[in-house]
């Protein structure tokens, strides 16, 4: 004979447990039904009557099967430095995460309680450790032979370009400037010839041509955005 299916509420076998989506009610001393996500207990079970559930009210939720008398309140609206990545529904809490360029300075169980802006490394300093969702950028001084000329939360120190002839030596905040040894074409006054330097940058950056000038013209230093370092958070 097949085992009889027990309908809630029922007394569990001695030493036994209740089934999935049921709980043992200590007062009724019975296995009783839990309420599904999005609902809560409105009337607890008795010895002969099962749990009665009701929907969560607006701005409240339950995420799990439960027998709580009240749904949980959804968190407050996301602040201006946050993005709502999960809306408040009857089955889930609102989740706020930090928007790009920010990191979570004070986290909570899900999402972030307090966001802070990622640190920007000033010229002469590069990103040693990129910012993550939960940690700030760490800056370090550019080592000899490298530079950073930007104020950025993503740019690393890049190697100076190697010149056949150095016009201006590089420092921590400026690239080296090369003097061209190849003959220059006739150009309009003030025009700049940009030959390819001997070596390219590290793999983190795209090659940037060095300026070359005709005698008597002023130097033009290239300033442009460099791509974000791997794993960092862009603006």
């Amino acid at each position: 004979l097949p085992a009889q299916v027990a309908f809630t509420p029922y007394a569990p076998e001695p030493g036994g447990t209740c089934r999935l989506r049921e709980y043992y009610d200590q007062t009724a001393q019975m296995c009783c039904s839990k309420c599904p996500p999005g609902q809560h207990a409105k009337v607890f079970c008795t010895k002969t009557s099962d749990t009665v559930c009701d929907s969560c009210e607006d701005s409240t939720y339950t995420q799990l099967w439960n027998w709580v008398p009240e749904c949980l309140s959804c968190g407050s609206r996301c602040s201006s430095d946050q993005v709502e990545t999960q809306a408040c529904t009857r089955e889930q809490n609102r989740i706020c995460t930090c928007r790009p360029g920010w990191y979570c300075a004070l986290s909570k169980q899900e999402g972030c309680r307090l966001c802070a802006q990622l640190r920007k490394c000033r010229p002469g300093f590069g990103v040693a450790r990129p910012g993550t969702e939960t940690s700030d950028v760490v800056c370090k001084p550019c080592a000899p032979g490298t530079f950073s000329n930007t104020t950025s939360s993503t740019d690393i120190c890049r190697p100076h370009q190697i010149c056949h002839v150095v016009a201006i030596p590089g420092n921590a905040s400026m690239d080296a400037v090369c003097t061209s040894t190849s003959p220059t074409r006739s150009m309009a006054p003030g025009a700049v010839h940009l030959p390819q330097p001997v070596s390219t940058r590290s793999q983190h950056t795209q090659p940037t041509p060095a300026p070359s000038t005709a005698p008597g013209t002023s130097f033009l230093l290239p300033v442009g955005p460099s791509p974000p370092a791997e794993g960092s958070t862009g603006d």
Partner: antibody, heavy 119, light 106 residues
């Protein structure tokens, strides 16, 4: 408006049976999820839950007193009854009836009736 | 059976002040605790249920908190009508009251 009112003999002798009545209005014991219970307070002491009865006639008793207690009801007359057998001086107390709602909280109470057990 | 230990048994406080009462239970009661105010000649009045939820019409001067086996109840901005005895009630496993706390005003 929910109201409850207890009534009883006032004085009993040891070994007698106490009969108490709770008369209530503003709700019905035919209403799903409602019940009526009894709580007492010996003079100068704290509250003690005794028993209660649900809309579906399920009954619960304080394990320490279960053998002496009987709760019953008359839903048509909005009455709940409590009997305590073999009373003793330790049963001298104020007896309250209270409504209990589906989440098991006593939310409305009567003013109480006093019982003195004395020989 | 669950045992309820309520403390203090009595306390005295000044008008406008704040008092806190605690209830410790012999086992985890999953926040199923209520707090009552009881005045002589009347039935107890439900103030708070499920640890911290105020009953309708109860002023926000009354508050409750706790979890597991430790629970507390506070009254701030004490008023003369707060003079009463206060009880905790667990309703996780049958029903059991704490011993009560008699509040007096200095």
């Amino acid at each position: 408006q929910v109201t409850l009112k207890e009534s009883g003999p006032g004085i009993l002798q040891p070994s007698q049976t106490l009969s108490l009545t709770c008369s209530f209005s503003g709700f019905s014991l035919n209403t799903f999820g409602l019940g009526v219970g009894w709580i007492r307070q010996p003079s100068g002491k704290g509250l003690e839950w005794l028993t209660h009865i649900w809309w579906n006639d399920d009954k619960y008793y304080n394990p320490a007193l279960k053998s002496r207690l009987t709760i019953s009801r008359d839903t048509s007359e909005n009455l709940v009854f409590l009997k305590i057998a073999n009373v003793d001086t330790a049963d001298t107390a104020t007896y309250y009836c209270a409504r209990i709602e589906g989440l098991r909280r006593f939310d409305y109470w009567g003013q109480g009736t006093t019982l003195t057990v004395s020989s | 059976d669950i045992q309820m230990t309520q403390s203090p048994s009595s306390l005295s406080a000044s008008l406008g002040g704040k008092v806190t009462i605690t209830c410790k239970t012999s086992q985890d009661i999953n926040k199923f605790i209520a707090w009552y105010q009881h005045k002589p000649g009347k039935g107890p009045r439900l103030l708070i249920h499920y640890t911290s939820t105020l009953q309708p019409g109860i002023p926000s001067r009354f508050s409750g908190s706790g979890s597991g086996r430790d629970y507390s109840f506070s009254i701030s901005d004490l008023e003369p009508e707060d003079i009463a005895t206060y009880y905790c009630l667990q309703y996780a496993n049958l029903w059991a009251f704490g011993g009560g706390t008699k509040l007096e005003i200095k």
